[in-house]
């Protein structure tokens, strides 16, 4: 049946899809402060722009009686029973916010015909890559293993004169769903990743990844995990590590390696930490004083798509151009709008851009340093600190395999 | 393209501040760092210091370290360079520019002349 | 960090090359790739015109190159122009993170 869009006359509506099952386990009542934040925001934008139209958000609750698992991986069919709602009470807003499970959000797009654009907080796996309506506005798998690839491959840093070709990817399969996704761009044989190769192992068991830091004859002297340094320490704990291990542990939504009292343990000595630069504005904003850091990118990514939203609303009304069509559908993509901590640029295929940062520890004050940055937009590396106090030898990333020598 | 844009000129009595301003229009400050580089009447391009804006780490040379502050609002694209303790010999043109590689600035401000006199 | 040593002045007559030396130390020089020249007008902000020791930004002549050996870079102008009349400055980083320009060198066509 025919589903009206709110979405004319003056009133435009965003159907946000609140889910049991959701890419971080954050209180639906938290989202629902960020999306009304975001609301107040966008209405102040558009009046200020002479714009004299309301906007609302309507949310979309899940019954719960058969996805309260809360866990992405049962996630499947939750979003289709929210459309049939929609479709049932026949009320649709001119854009849809959700899901954030990949799992869901492929399945959507699979099995019906999205003629309204899509916002999502994750959606990170690469099957929810290059979707003609889909926005995502935390970084996607897709975007780290550019990063990756581009960082084996340099060989003109300071600290890094040798290129990387092969790297062991720990994955045991209880991640969490950005985690679970980034690992399985990796470990896909036929991702950019696995491509650019020429080795890559994925390490199963606990005791596969503990057996391959002293292992002499082991095959790559870089591994790739995703967690916090909590994760990383219940699998390490302070066993010896050969002094050519890299443990590249990827953390993208986390902030604490940027607060001010915050000392490396000893055991982050040979990782380098992936991360993103650090958002600070939210911390005075009334829905995130509760939320840890991990949250607090979650909830910023609702509110920026609220935002991007509000964006789009304004630029079609002030051209005079009709919402409810393909091209407004289409035109969440290659821009940049003005996001709650500062712009926000969105690539060729609706994916957000970001800063990712690459940290070590330094041997003299145990806090974490800016090695690099990265800029997604762009795909470049930039040296940051040029004498990282590393506790590899000569201050110097080491070659991938042993004793291979320059190449 | 980004340009950035600087105020014209200031003038100040030694022994105050200045506070010089470095808007990115046409884009944003981006991961991209913003240095600060003075050149004084007749002579040649002096570092000052650097910001990255989007992770607010800076550097500064060492001449300027305690006297120059460099700061950035990303919201609104914009750096600034604080010099405080200042004396006659800081008259110069005061430029910003965008790192895009280290050491390597591409897109430059177009200078403000901060004359320090009593 | 006082500034990387140049040579005041060099001249040439339109049509020549002329080179431009930069002499640092170990620490910046010659410990990294990341040496950059700049050409300045009167009255104008300077302009990139070489970085990362020899790549050419979009947009700038072919007749400018550069190079480096040891801690001493290098900036070639051949075919000398007239509009080629500017001061010269390189540029590089330090062990320190830090940024340090040269003392400069005023180009006069001849």
């Known amino acids: 049946s025919q589903v009206s869009q709110n979405c004319h006359n003056g009133s435009y509506e965003i159907s946000v899809l609140m889910m049991d099952n959701s890419a971080f386990a954050e209180p639906l009542e938290n989202v629902e402060d960020a999306v009304n934040e975001g609301l107040e925001i966008v209405r102040g934008r558009l009046q200020n722009a002479g714009l004299n139209v309301t906007v609302n958000a309507s949310f979309m609750y899940s019954d719960g009686l058969i996805h309260n698992s809360g866990d992405c991986r049962s996630s499947t069919c939750e979003g289709l029973d929210l459309l049939r709602k929609i479709s049932n009470a026949k009320r649709m807003g001119c854009v849809l916010m959700g899901p954030s499970c990949t799992y869901s959000t492929f399945q959507m797009y699979l099995d019906t015909e999205l003629s309204y654009p899509m916002i999502s907080a994750g959606s990170f796996g690469l099957s929810c890559d290059y979707k003609e309506t889909l926005t995502r506005l935390m970084s996607p798998a897709r975007k780290l293993t550019y990063f990756l690839v581009n960082f084996w491959k340099t060989n003109d840093l300071p600290f890094k004169t040798y290129s990387w070709s092969t790297s062991y990817v720990y994955k045991n399969g209880t991640e969490s769903e950005d985690c679970f996704w980034y690992l399985n761009a990796l470990e896909a044989s036929v991702s950019y990743f696995s491509h650019e190769l020429s080795f890559k192992l994925v390490l199963r068991q606990d005791k596969e990844f503990q057996d391959i830091l002293m292992d002499h004859n082991r095959k790559s002297n870089v591994i790739v995990m995703c967690g916090d340094p909590q994760f990383l320490y219940k699998l390490k704990g302070d066993r010896a590590v050969a002094e050519d291990i890299v443990i590249i542990l990827v953390d993208l939504f986390n902030d604490q390696y940027f607060e001010d009292n915050v000392t490396a343990p000893d055991y982050m000595k040979n990782v380098l930490v992936l991360t993103q630069s650090p958002g600070n504005s939210l911390l005075n904003s009334s829905f995130s004083r509760n939320l840890s850091p991990t949250k607090r990118d979650f909830a910023l990514a609702y509110l920026n798509g609220i935002l991007l939203f509000g964006h789009m609303l304004k630029t079609f009304l002030e051209n005079g151009e009709n919402i409810t069509t393909p091209k407004f559908a289409h035109a969440f993509r290659n821009l940049t709008f003005e996001g709650y901590d500062g712009p926000v640029t969105l690539d060729d295929w609706g994916d957000v851009d970001s800063t990712m940062v690459l940290l070590y520890t330094s041997v003299d004050t145990k806090k974490y340093k800016v090695l690099l940055t990265y800029d997604t937009h762009v795909n470049q590396t930039n040296p940051v600190d040029m004498s990282p106090t590393f506790t590899w030898k000569n201050s110097k990333l080491p070659n991938d395999i042993t004793d291979r020598g320059p190449q | 393209e980004v340009q950035l844009v600087q105020p014209g000129a200031e003038v100040k009595k030694p022994g105050s501040s200045v506070k010089v301003s470095c808007k990115a229009s046409?884009?944003?400050?981006?991961?991209?760092?913003i240095s600060w580089v003075r050149q004084a009447p007749g002579q040649g391009l002096e570092w000052m210091g650097r910001i990255i804006p989007i992770l607010g780490i800076t550097n500064y040379a060492q001449k300027f370290q305690g006297r120059v502050t460099i700061t950035a609002d990303k919201s609104t694209s914009t750096a600034y360079m604080e010099l405080s303790s200042l004396r006659s010999e800081d008259t110069a043109v005061y430029f910003c520019?965008?790192?895009?590689?280290?050491?390597?600035?591409?897109?430059w401000g177009q200078g403000t002349l901060v004359t320090v006199s009593s | 960090q006082s500034g990387l040593t140049q040579p005041a002045s060099v001249s040439g007559s339109p049509g020549q090359s002329i080179t431009i030396s930069c002499t640092g130390t170990s620490s910046d020089v010659g410990g990294y790739n990341y040496v950059s020249w700049y050409q300045q007008h009167p009255g104008k902000a300077p302009k990139l015109m070489i970085y990362e020791v020899s790549n050419r930004p979009s947009g700038v002549s072919n007749r400018f190159s550069g190079s480096k050996s040891g801690n001493t870079a290098s900036l070639t102008i051949s075919g000398l122009q007239a509009e080629d009349e500017a001061d010269y400055y390189c540029s590089t980083v330090t062990s320190l993170s830090t940024y340090v320009f040269g003392t400069g060198t005023k180009l006069t066509v001849l």
């Open positions: 046409g884009g944003t400050l981006s991961s991209y760092a």
């Open positions: 520019a965008r790192d895009q590689r280290p050491a390597s600035m591409d897109v």
